[in-house]
Each structure stands twice: as structure tokens, then as C-alpha cells.
Interface confidence: low
């Protein structure tokens, strides 16, 4: 399997909520043996390998973000942790995953990774990651609401409030 | 900070049993798998087993399988090791681990001082 | 089971020199799931770089570590007096995790 980043970029105004997504590709085995480990955390584009250091996202680390179940399951994190630091990560049947961030501010800029382990019998298989880039603005020459530039062209697409929803 | 205490260890027949303990401070113990890896006197390290962060899955090298339990109460941050059958080739210095992730998917980022254990008629 | 093989046993060299100690894995690594660990008598071992080439939370950036699939290397650039320890590799990349079996880095 593997995983997709829809945009690989995320411009936002300060104050505006936003949702970072990734997308499971490919056959997932949906066994009784197999689950599915996936999590968000901040990193840096290093000399080696994009996502290779693993930060935590206000405070919280990939362990307190993370979701486990089976296959192509719905999901979504322990809310009051989370949810104290403006943070929900949540996925769905469809191999969608997502952490929304709330209140965003300058701060938050950065490089965001999901990643995505496969578990088979309790032994690590598979271990796969996307990367994109979240720009916070301010000021006059940020954008009312979050615009997002698709991973595959440069076409941006703007992303008013009611967009960002969970997914329970 | 991360601490990681093993206790337990001593001198013990062969055939008997011993129970090691780790605990654990200076973080999410219910975050991290754990592990335990021990060392022959003046020989290398050799891995002895994993517990998930939950207690819900483990695993074993070969040669202490059948013979070791791992477990943990993660409402007292505490691993444990519990050895039945004890032989003269498990006499070790026996360390506690961390699993950097929830399962054994990531390295050992911290280690506790060990505890030795000497199998001995 | 994933055999690792440390080369030189044993390394004799003098502060400010480079070292290079090598790694080398049975069968492939996938991922380059391989960690390195610095040990002193009486301590317990010590994370030095972990994913083959990244250095642990406040390892000096003297210590760096390269390769991928089978064959992997850890050099320290410039000895300091505290590097003179022995050096384990391991790989993470299967069931049962192995070690290698250590390389002794020794004063000259």
C-alpha cells in the first residue's frame, strides 16, 4: 500500500481552523492478524530523508496522536487530550485520514507527516509517510480562508470554513 | 526525565525461577512498547523480548521462548520479566528498554542500568 | 534471523583521529531499520543514531552514521577522550532483533 497526500501544500490565515489529509492507496489486507498504526507528527525536510525526525504537534507526540484498528476502519484519537490542544485526528472507511487543527497561529507553520505502519502478527511489515507544508499568515496579505495546492499541480484551491469537518 | 530502575536480579539454581522488575518514570509509560535485552558477561547484547504498549501482544528470542514471560501493569509503570527454568547460559546482566513506538516498530531510545542475574549450582 | 557482522573487532586509534566502524546485515534491511549504540564498561548502552543515519536526541554531530540495505557505517570524525567505548549496531527490521556482535574502539 501506500499513502497520498491530496495537497501538498496549506496556506492559512491566523485564527482559521484547518484539516491535513492523507489517503491509504493500494490493497489493504483486512485479516484478523493485521492492524493499521497511523499518526501525525511535525518534522523538518532533512539532509537524509523528509519526515525522518519526529516532533510533537503542540505539545502532543505521535504516540498521543495516533489511531489503531484494523484495515479501512473508522477512527479517531482520545478526544479530551486532543481536543485541550486544539487537535483531532480521525479516519474513515475509505482510507481518508486526517488531524484537524483549530485556532491556527503562526506557530503552527511547518512541515506535517502522517504515517502509517502495518502490523501483521505483531511484527512490523510496512511503514509508510507523507509529507506537506503548513503556511500560517498574517497580516494583509493572508488569505481569508485556507487555500490548498494539490500535491500533482500547482492549481489552488480555496477552502472556506464549512469545509473542515470531522470524519467519526 | 526518562528513568528505567530493573530489580530482582540475584543468584539462583539452575531449574529455578526469578521474577525481574523495571520501573519506569519521566514519561507515558502506556505509550511505549518495552522491552528486555540482556548481556553474558563480557559478551555482547542479545534482545529477550517485547511487550506492546497495552499488554496486548509480546514476542521472544528462540532461546528463552517457553521459558519467559513478559508483562506489565501500566497503572503501577511497571514492566516485569518472569523466568521459569533457569540455566547457566541465561546468567546475564538483564536491561530494561524503551520502544521509541507503541509497538516494536522503532529502536531503543532508553535503557535502564541492568540487573544481574547468575544462574549458579 | 538477520545476522549482523561488526568489523574491526577491535579498533585502535588516537584522539582527534576519524574512526569508521562498519555494519554489515545477512540479508537486506528494508527501510534502513538499523540503530547504533555506544556501551562503556559497567553502563548501560547509549542511543547514538537510529533509521541508519539519525542522530539521537544529544549526540554530538562528531558521530554520523550512512549505508542502506546490507552494508552500514558509523564514523566519529574526531575522537574525544569519552568516545573510547564499544559500539553496537542492531537492526530493527525483523523479528528476533540482532546485534551485532560489538566493535571495541581502544586508545592507541
Known amino acids: 500500500f501506500k499513502v497520498a497526500t491530496p495537497y501538498s501544500l496549506y496556506v492559512c490565515p491566523e485564527g482559521q481552523n484547518v484539516t491535513l489529509t492523507c489517503r491509504l492507496l493500494g490493497p489493504v489486507d483486512k485479516g484478523h492478524d493485521v492492524t493499521f498504526y497511523k499518526t501525525w507528527y511535525r518534522s523538518s525536510r532533512g539532509e537524509v530523508q523528509t519526515c525522518s525526525e519526529r516532533r510533537p504537534i503542540r505539545n502532543l507526540t505521535f504516540q498521543d496522536l495516533h489511531l489503531h484498528h484494523g484495515g479501512h476502519q473508522a477512527a479517531n484519537t482520545s478526544h479530551d487530550l486532543a481536543q485541550r490542544h486544539g487537535l483531532e485526528s480521525a479516519s474513515d472507511h475509505h482510507g481518508n485520514f486526517s488531524i484537524t487543527m483549530r485556532n491556527l497561529t503562526l506557530l503552527d507553520s511547518g512541515l506535517y507527516c502522517c504515517l502509517v505502519v502495518e502490523i501483521r502478527h505483531h511484527h512490523s511489515e510496512h511503514r509508510v509517510h507523507g509529507a506537506m507544508e503548513l503556511q500560517v499568515q498574517t497580516g494583509k496579505d493572508a488569505p481569508s480562508n485556507c487555500v490548498v495546492y494539490p500535491s500533482s499541480s500547482q492549481e489552488s484551491e480555496n477552502i472556506t470554513a464549512h469545509h473542515h469537518h470531522h470524519h467519526h | 526525565q526518562v528513568q528505567l530502575v530493573e530489580s530482582g536480579g540475584g543468584v539462583v539454581q539452575p531449574g529455578r525461577s526469578l521474577r525481574l522488575s523495571c520501573a519506569a518514570s519521566?514519561?507515558?509509560?502506556?505509550?511505549?512498547?518495552m522491552h528486555w535485552v540482556r548481556q553474558a558477561p563480557g559478551k555482547g547484547l542479545e534482545w529477550v523480548a517485547i511487550?506492546?504498549?497495552?499488554?496486548?501482544?509480546?514476542d521472544y528470542a528462540d532461546s528463552v521462548k517457553g521459558r519467559f514471560t513478559i508483562s506489565r501493569d501500566n497503572s503501577k509503570n511497571t514492566l516485569y520479566l518472569q523466568m521459569n527454568s533457569l540455566r547457566a547460559e541465561d546468567t546475564a546482566v538483564y536491561y530494561c528498554?524503551?520502544?521509541?513506538?507503541?509497538?516494536?516498530?522503532?529502536?531503543?531510545?532508553?535503557w535502564g542500568q541492568g540487573t544481574l542475574v547468575t544462574v549458579s549450582s | 534471523e538477520i545476522v549482523l557482522t561488526q568489523s574491526p573487532a577491535t579498533l585502535s586509534l588516537s584522539p582527534g583521529e576519524r574512526a569508521t566502524l562498519s555494519c554489515r546485515a545477512s540479508?537486506?534491511?528494508?527501510?534502513?531499520?538499523l540503530a547504533w549504540y555506544q556501551q562503556k564498561p559497567g553502563q548501560a548502552p547509549r542511543l547514538l543514531i537510529y533509521?541508519?543515519?539519525n542522530r539521537a536526541t544529544g549526540i554530538p554531530a562528531r558521530f554520523s552514521g550512512s549505508g542502506s540495505g546490507t552494508d552500514f557505517t558509523l564514523t566519529i570524525s574526531s575522537l574525544e577522550p569519552e568516545d573510547f567505548a564499544t559500539y553496537y549496531c542492531?537492526?530493527?527490521?525483523?523479528?528476533?532483533?540482532?546485534f551485532g556482535q560489538g566493535t571495541k574502539l581502544e586508545i592507541k
Open positions: 528498554a524503551r520502544d521509541s513506538g507503541f509497538y516494536s516498530s522503532y529502536y531503543f531510545d532508553y
Open positions: 540479508q537486506s534491511v528494508s527501510s534502513s531499520y
Open positions: 511487550i506492546w504498549y497495552d499488554g496486548s501482544n509480546d
Open positions: 519521566g514519561f507515558t509509560f502506556s505509550h511505549h512498547a
Open positions: 533509521d541508519a543515519s
Open positions: 542492531q537492526q530493527y527490521n525483523s523479528y528476533p532483533y540482532t
